[in-house]
């Protein structure tokens, strides 16, 4: 004959454990029902009555089957540098993640405790490693033959244009300027400057110095950062 199904509360057989979605109540010494996600134990079980569950109040939650006396409080509202990617419901906590252009500098179990703006690479530097949800941008100086004339968290170093006749040579922060005749190619071979693999890292060696990043021209220079209260258009 099949074993008879026990209804909670029931005394477990010696050496056995309670079933799924049940817990052992030390006081009653019985297997009792857990409360479902979104609920909590309003009244604990006795030898003769099962757990009484109640719904979580507003701004509180339980995510798992449980027998907690009170639901957990949802986290505080997301800050201005964050977006709410999961709302606070009776069954789940609010999750805040960093808004675009920011990354999580200090994470918590779910979501982010502290967001920080992604680093912007200044002219002469390009993005060597893009920012992610949890890591900042890494900027590197533009290699010879490449340039960046922006302050950006996304722009990489781009190759100088190749001219038939160069009016002004390019440098790390400025493209080459051609004479009025059109350039032979708009881009140098290789298309973009990406970080070299780690295996090429030189240690205690002296690479050939790059050309100086200081051109003698006083025009066609990149736009710089702007005063905080005066917009973002530079001069």
């Amino acid at each position: 004959l099949p074993a008879q199904v026990a209804f909670t509360p029931y005394a477990p057989e010696p050496g056995s454990t309670c079933r799924l979605r049940e817990y052992y109540d030390q006081t009653a010494q019985m297997c009792c029902s857990k409360c479902s996600p979104g609920q909590h134990a309003k009244v604990f079980c006795t030898k003769t009555s099962d757990t009484v569950c109640d719904s979580c109040e507003d701004s509180t939650y339980t995510q798992l089957w449980n027998w907690v006396p009170e639901c957990l409080s949802c986290g505080s509202r997301c800050s201005s540098d964050q977006v709410e990617t999961q709302a606070c419901t009776r069954e789940q906590n609010r999750i805040c993640t960093c808004r675009p252009g920011w990354y999580c500098a200090l994470s918590k179990q779910e979501g982010c405790r502290l967001c920080a703006p992604l680093r912007k690479c200044r002219p002469g530097f390009g993005v060597a490693r893009p920012g992610t949800e949890t890591s900042d941008v890494v900027c590197k100086p533009c290699a010879p033959g490449t340039f960046s004339n922006t302050t950006s968290s996304t722009d990489i170093c781009r190759p100088h244009q190749i001219c038939n006749v160069v009016a002004i040579p390019g440098n790390a922060s400025m493209d080459a300027v051609c004479t009025s005749t059109s350039p032979t190619r708009s881009m140098a071979p290789g298309a973009v400057h990406l970080p070299q693999p780690v295996s090429t890292r030189s240690q205690h060696t002296q690479p050939t110095p790059e050309p100086s990043t200081a051109p003698s021209t006083s025009f066609l220079l990149p736009m710089g950062p702007s005063p905080p209260a005066e917009g973002s258009t530079g001069d």
């Epitope: 680093r119 912007k120 690479c121 200044r122 002219p123 002469g124 530097f125 060597a128 890494v138 900027c139 590197k140 100086p141 290699a143 302050t151 922060s173 970080p195 070299q196 090429t200 890292r201 030189s202 240690q203 060696t205 002296q206 690479p207 110095p209 790059e210 100086s212 990043t213 200081a214 051109p215 006083s218 025009f219 220079l221 990149p222 736009m223 710089g224 950062p225 702007s226 005063p227 905080p228 530079g234 001069d235």
Partner: antibody, heavy 119, light 106 residues
């Protein structure tokens, strides 16, 4: 906490060379370039050059191209400056400083290393 | 190459004074200008970057501004601990320090 610890004072004879170190801690060494800056006694600051510890790429001020050689060892988080053919003009304090390539420039400095050239 | 001219080279002021230090660029440096403070026997310390931005941990009495190619560091109310030499530094077009302004108490 970000810290750049430079090696101790050096005394060199004219014509000899010295090598100064700058050990970084408290941040990812290869994510920043290291600048070197010279300060002669009672004088101002002179930018000498930078090195990217990740790849060994360098840039020098014209004045220091024949004088200074910049290197770095990523495994020990240390940057070096080698000063050759010393003369009395090289008597100075040399500083290292880090730079992440953002508008926030040289936000942490070493304490400086004094080099005295004397016969 | 860009030249930076700092003035005055020596400035005497009293505690509580509003102090302005000037730095003139020989050509456009597009706000990529920083100010460093150096006390005797110490390394330089970043005060202001990108012309206007106050470095973390620097007292709010320090501020930076600009008019054309003239850049200014202002100390709104001079404190005894502000006695130092101040250097401007351009990093738009290579790298260059000004000659410095030594600030002393009257």
């Amino acid at each position: 906490e970000v810290h750049l610890q430079q090696s101790g004072p050096e005394v060199g004879r004219p014509g000899s060379s010295v090598k100064i170190s700058c050990k970084a801690s408290g941040y990812t060494f290869t994510d920043y370039i290291i600048h070197w800056v010279k300060q002669s006694p009672g004088q101002g600051l002179e930018w000498m050059g930078w090195i990217d510890p990740d790849y060994g790429n360098t840039d020098y001020a014209d004045k220091f191209k024949k004088k200074a050689t910049l290197t770095a060892d990523a495994s020990s988080n240390t940057a070096f400056i080698h000063l050759s053919r010393l003369t009395s003009e090289d008597t100075a304090t040399y500083f290292c400083a880090r730079d992440d390539g953002s508008p926030l420039v040289m936000d942490a400095w070493g304490q400086g290393t004094s080099v005295t050239v004397s016969s | 190459n860009i030249q930076l001219t700092q003035s005055p080279s020596l400035l005497s002021a009293s505690v509580g004074d509003r102090v302005t230090l000037s730095c003139n660029g020989s050509q456009n440096i597009d706000n990529y200008l920083a100010w460093f403070q150096q006390k005797l026997g110490e390394a330089p310390k970043l005060l202001i970057y990108s012309t206007y931005s106050l470095q973390t941990g620097i007292p709010s009495r320090f501020s930076g501004s600009r008019s054309g190619t003239d850049y200014t560091l202002t100390i709104s109310s001079l404190q005894p601990e502000d006695v130092a030499t101040y250097f401007c530094f351009q990093y738009n077009n290579g790298y260059m320090f000004g000659a410095g302004t030594k600030l002393e108490l009257k």
